[in-house]
Amino acid sequence: EPPTACSDKQYLHDGQCCDLCQPGSRLTSHCTALEKTQCHPCDSGEFSAQWNREIRCHQHKYCDPNLGLRVQQKGTSETDTICTCEEGWHCTSEACESCVLHRSCSPGFGVKQIATGVSDTICEPCPVGFFSNVSSAFEKCHPWTSCETKDLVVQQAGTNKTDVVCGPQDRLR
């Protein structure tokens, strides 16, 4: 009596259990009562990641430099190529099909988290006591200058975009 289910790494074909092709190969012919499944290694530039019965391997992903992409990890017969973005850029999606330029944090904001190949810059407002006077993808907020440690007094208050201005302690009001 023909089987109705096959074991793991097998598949049912014409009433019999055939072996699946292993990762890195593709199906060339199904098994018969006399012959085992025939498989063939994936060609260069192709891969198959799982036990399979596919007649074609998958093409390796192309990391298009025109889209800001570069190869992070070269593909093998069992794995796809992994793309990442050029320095200063990050992926627009998890699949990393294209890249966009890292965001800069505006004056009044500092970098909370520096961008990576897969995530954009995260900015945060500078709190009281800190400032940022530049647009940057790397700089955190800087603390206001402590005038007292220089034996000076605050002549002008700091803001989230400007440092305090220190001056001599000779001005009475």
């Epitope: 407002p125 955190k140 007094v153 302690q169 001005r171």
Partner: antibody, heavy 122, light 113 residues
Framework: QVQLQQSGAELMKPGASVKIPCKAT????????IEWVKQRPGHGLEWIGE????????NYNEKFKGKATFTADTSSNTAYMQLSSLTSEDSAVYYC???????????????WGQGTLVTVSA | DIVMSQSPSSLAVSVGEKVTMSCKSS????????????LAWYQQKPGQSPKLLIY???TRESGVPDRFTGSGSGTDFTLTISSVKAEDLAVYYC?????????FGGGTKLEIK
């Protein structure tokens, strides 16, 4: 110990100006911001702004620019807030307060005056 | 401006009960540079000036009874009174000092049953 002394109450006519004093004792007056806070019944607390007596440097809440003016006299350790063109909306208790730290870490208000009640009435 | 919202606006509890009140900010008060939350809590008893209870969201001011506890981070904060006393009758305000203008919540009025 740190103390902030305010005047009791002021009854003012609409259109007039009032200058509210806040006398500080128990610390180096010039080195710490003096904060000003408004409290109207049912309106909670509103920050008006701050003055650093050593330099006269100020920060104002945009809402109170043109209404409030801060000054400080380091010889008498007194900060002042002048309110101009008074209307009934300015009737409130006005507090002066001092942050715990000096000027560079944000202000939570550790010390408070007892408040000055300003009533604006024709 | 950062908007501070407090809830409930009032609550009535019996002496000995635990009470919690909430304060929410319209933007995060946590600064990653020092991992501090720029939030303070004040108590204002009838006819008195406000009194500082808590700063940096959870640091109790010197002399404040340990039944008062501040907690929370980012945009959601809580003031808890573990066992209310009759003397705790007051309005409680939160305040952000992350950015100018400093802003206060509308207050939570605590009444004693």
């Amino acid at each position: 110990q740190v103390q902030l002394q305010q005047s009791g109450a002021e009854l003012m006519k609409p259109g007039a100006s009032v200058k509210i004093p806040c006398k500080a004792t128990g610390y180096t007056f010039s080195s710490y911001w003096i904060e000003w806070v408004k409290q109207r019944p049912g309106h909670g607390l509103e920050w008006i702004g701050e003055v650093l007596p050593g330099s006269g440097s100020t920060n104002y809440n945009e809402k109170f620019k043109g209404k409030a003016t801060f000054t400080a006299d380091t010889s008498s350790n007194t900060a002042y807030m002048q309110l101009s063109s008074l209307t009934s909306e300015d009737s409130a208790v006005y507090y002066c307060a001092r942050p715990y730290y000096r000027y560079d870490v944000g202000a939570w208000f550790a010390y408070w005056g007892q408040g000055t009640l300003v009533t604006v009435s024709a | 401006d950062i908007v501070m919202s407090q809830s409930p606006s009032s609550l009535a509890v019996s002496v000995g009960e635990k009470v919690t009140m909430s304060c929410k900010s319209s933007q995060s008060l946590l600064y990653s540079g020092n991992q501090k939350n720029y939030l303070a809590w004040y108590q204002q008893k009838p006819g008195q000036s406000p009194k500082l209870l808590i700063y940096w969201a959870s640091t109790r001011e010197s002399g404040v009874p340990d039944r008062f506890t501040g907690s929370g981070s980012g945009t959601d904060f809580t003031l808890t009174i573990s066992s209310v006393k009759a003397e705790d009758l007051a309005v409680y305000y939160c305040q952000q000092y992350y950015s100018y203008p400093y802003t206060f919540g509308g207050g939570t009025k605590l009444e004693i049953k």
